[in-house]
């Protein structure tokens, strides 16, 4: 392209050095905070995700700032302020620290922020070939339509009574719960 260091191609205080081979007439050595072949791009220091626990990163040029989510503090939002303090999870759920917000790990059959909503493990229709799904407290249970078997009713039963079970794991029977 014919551009040389004499043309001042390095921006933002970059140091121009003459190229060692004919294909690169110059090389820019960029100062901290800048990148690109001509030091024209500001380095996005937030791309390194320095703010922990979901904090919002702000690059102020001269410094980085983290805006922390509720429940966290510190220059990099690294301090957990115990978001479970005073929080209750219903129906046997347990509060889990982290994530910046009160979070419940719910017992089987319950869901929602505070485990107050009934969760239906059958909603995804896990029982194949028209099998019926039941939300038993021990886990979902499938009752297969006639002609099918397996924990999820995935295997057809042949007319002679044998099934198309490919080397079934021990104890696999119709209706075994999926925990």
């Amino acid at each position: 392209s014919g551009v040389t260091c004499a043309d001042g191609p390095c921006f933002n205080g970059g140091l121009c050095v003459g190229g060692a081979d004919p294909d690169s007439a110059y090389i820019c050595h960029c100062p901290p905070g800048f990148q690109g072949s001509n030091c024209e791009k500001r380095v996005d220091r937030c791309s390194l995700q320095p703010c922990r626990n979901g904090g919002l990163c702000l690059d102020l040029g001269h410094a980085l700032r983290c805006r922390c989510r509720a429940g966290f503090a510190g220059p990099r939002c690294e301090h957990d302020l115990d978001d479970c303090a005073g929080r209750a999870c219903a129906n046997g759920g347990t509060c889990v620290e982290g994530g910046g917000a009160h979070r419940c790990s719910c017992a089987l059959g319950f869901g929602g922020r505070d485990c107050r909503e009934r969760a239906d493990p059958c909603a995804a229709r896990p029982c194949a070939h028209g099998g019926r799904c039941y939300a038993h407290f021990s886990g979902l249970v499938c009752a297969c339509a006639p002609g099918y078997m397996g924990a999820r009713c995935e295997f057809p039963v042949h007319p002679d009574g044998a099934s198309a079970l490919p080397a079934a794991p021990p104890g696999l029977r119709p209706g075994d719960p999926q925990r």
Epitope: D120, R132, H136, G175
Partner: antibody
């Protein structure tokens, strides 16, 4: 507290009709259950009548109950049993019961008495 | 599908053992979808055992279920006065069919 309560029982004449209602509290039929009707004649054992699977609304009946009994879901918390051409032999306590898996009834209502007599 | 219970009635002394048998004309679903209930006058049946041998929550451990396929047994070890009741077996069959046994009355003296 999960509960079932039956209503609609009473005295009915032979060949008459009656509709029983099962009302759930503490849970709703948005989850998948068999909501069933079981009857028990005085001094006899329980007898399964019919179920409705709340997952897709499909129904199942004892062979003797087909035609005269109809189970349906009236709302997210109520199930009904319509009975027609009632006979003296249909006199019994009618229970609403829930199957939550493994084919057993883990939750029962207190029952409602149906008396068929002239 | 017919479930036959034997014997009835059955009598036991307090602290004794009661054994009730339940036989099905065909295999229950999954070979073990059979349950046992206790019923007292004026009350609905109360489940004791499900899936042939699983004790329902809150049921005393003196109640034990066993068996598979078509033959099942309920055993009460160390019978109490409060165990005097009628006991029913109930099966679930392929095709979404339910059936109850005829019942066994247990007298505890």
């Amino acid at each position: 507290q999960e509960q079932l309560v039956e209503s609609g029982g009473g005295l009915v004449q032979p060949e008459g009709s009656l509709t029983l209602t099962c009302t759930a509290s503490g849970f709703s039929f948005s989850s998948s259950y068999d909501m069933c009707w079981v009857r028990q004649a005085p001094g006899k054992g329980p007898e399964w009548i019919a179920c409705i699977y709340t997952g897709d609304g499909s129904t199942d009946y004892a062979s003797w109950a087909k035609g005269r009994f109809t189970v349906s879901k009236a709302s997210s918390t109520t199930v009904t049993l319509q009975m027609t051409s009632l006979a003296v032999a249909d006199t019994a306590t009618y229970f609403c019961a829930r199957n939550s898996g493994y084919g057993y009834f883990g939750l029962w209502g207190p029952g409602t008495l149906v008396t068929v007599s002239s | 599908q017919v479930l036959t219970q034997t014997p009835s009635p059955v009598s036991a002394a307090v602290g004794g053992t009661v054994t009730i048998s339940c036989q099905s004309t065909e295999s229950v679903y999954g070979s073990d979808w059979l349950s046992w209930y206790q019923q007292k006058p004026g009350q609905p049946p109360k489940v004791l055992i499900y899936q042939a041998s699983n004790l329902e929550i809150g049921v005393p451990s003196r109640f034990k279920g066993s068996g598979s396929g078509t033959q099942f047994t309920l055993t009460i070890s160390g019978a109490q006065c409060d165990d005097a009741a009628t006991y029913y077996c109930q099966g679930y069959y392929s095709g979404y069919i339910y059936a109850f046994g005829g019942g066994t009355e247990v007298v505890v003296k």
